[in-house]
Amino acid sequence: LEVSESPGSIQVARGQPAVLPCTFTTSAALINLNVIWMVTPLSNANQPEQVILYQGGQMFDGAPRFHGRVGFTGTMPATNVSIFINNTQLSDTGTYQCLVNNLPDIGGRNIGVTGLTVLVPPSAPHCQIQGSQDIGSDVILLCSSEEGIPRPTYLWEKLDNTLKLPPTATQDQVQGTVTIRNISALSSGLYQCVASNAIGTSTCLLDLQVISPQPRNIG
């Protein structure tokens, strides 16, 4: 019995179906086929879980969180024992193993390993201004998404004809911050943060209103 090499890892957007491949060759009939799919979740590496089981001509459910979402892609028994997972969740990320036994065929490699990564587009980020908006001050524009896998990068731009940040601005696309030093009236305007990763983008906006000192009435 020989389980074929798997593609190594699969990436899927949250909520989309994933197919985890596992095929094997055997010299014996599939009368005593026994297949166990296990997962070692990324979130809990020391707690492997059963995903689905085929034994004695019957299918059995694995861990409750997979109920109704998992099944074999083809009619069993077969030499293709790939499975699908519908409505993938972040918690489905992990290392999946298919363990195949088909007595009396013993020996050879009977385990296939596939990594599954569930990707999450950035959630709508929150934009915030830190610091005084009085003319001459330094301000920091903050942007962060609560969700996003892979971790989003953040790009700030000013929404006007140029889409360019003021010349006194420095940007950190990893942290999602823009520091604008010595703000002037020209710093005022709409600033958009674009949070993006491999599978999506999301935005938020800020209205920076730089306040000039008001002339005092004398008398």
Epitope: A124, A185, L190, D207, Q209, V210
Partner: antibody, heavy 119, light 106 residues
Framework: EVKLVESGRGLVQPGGSLKLSCAAS????????MSWVRQTPEKRLEWVAY????????YYPDTVKGRFTISRDNAKNTLYLQMSSLKSEDTAMYYC????????????WGQGTLVTVSA | QIVLSQSPAILSASPGEKVTMTCRAS?????MHWYQQKPGSSPKPWIY???NLASGVPARFSGSGSGTSYSLTISRVEAEDAATYYC?????????FGRGTKLEIK
Amino acid sequence: EVKLVESGRGLVQPGGSLKLSCAASGFTFSSYSMSWVRQTPEKRLEWVAYISNGGGSTYYPDTVKGRFTISRDNAKNTLYLQMSSLKSEDTAMYYCARHDGNYPWFAYWGQGTLVTVSA
Amino acid sequence: QIVLSQSPAILSASPGEKVTMTCRASSSVSYMHWYQQKPGSSPKPWIYATSNLASGVPARFSGSGSGTSYSLTISRVEAEDAATYYCQQWSSDPPTFGRGTKLEIK
């Protein structure tokens, strides 16, 4: 009390021009960004133009870009909207609105001025 | 651009009833703002940044939501609440408004 009063209403032919004004009082005009928002006869609300508090930054939706120009005179506490190449779909009630805080939302509205574009 | 779908289009309620109207965005947004408009008047700011009541808005109003789903709730409807309520976002450019929910009092 914040007060925004629009003027410049009129009936204009397609392709024509019109300038709207908005007189502001009851607040330090130069400290706030402003926008124009319109409401179509079907009661749909559409943002038309934005200008920063100092007037150095303006922004428009694609529907009016190149045809409308927003400006302000902070010494006169007045906001303007110059509209040209007007189309029938520009027919609407035009409101001037003041922004507040750092979230772009329309915190104060004028009573509106009606612009009708028709042959 | 983000499309805001308001439901129901028309909401009929009796005084004292609790009512909820919803605003669904075609993509996730950071905040939702709400405006009240009565016939012949300009829109009034009602709720900003999802849950903050604008000045002068009665405490029976509340706003909530996140992501793509937001709502405005009136705990006990009064006759003066009859109006059209619009949601608005400017998390994503350009800013967009919903088509409104018209609240009628029986």
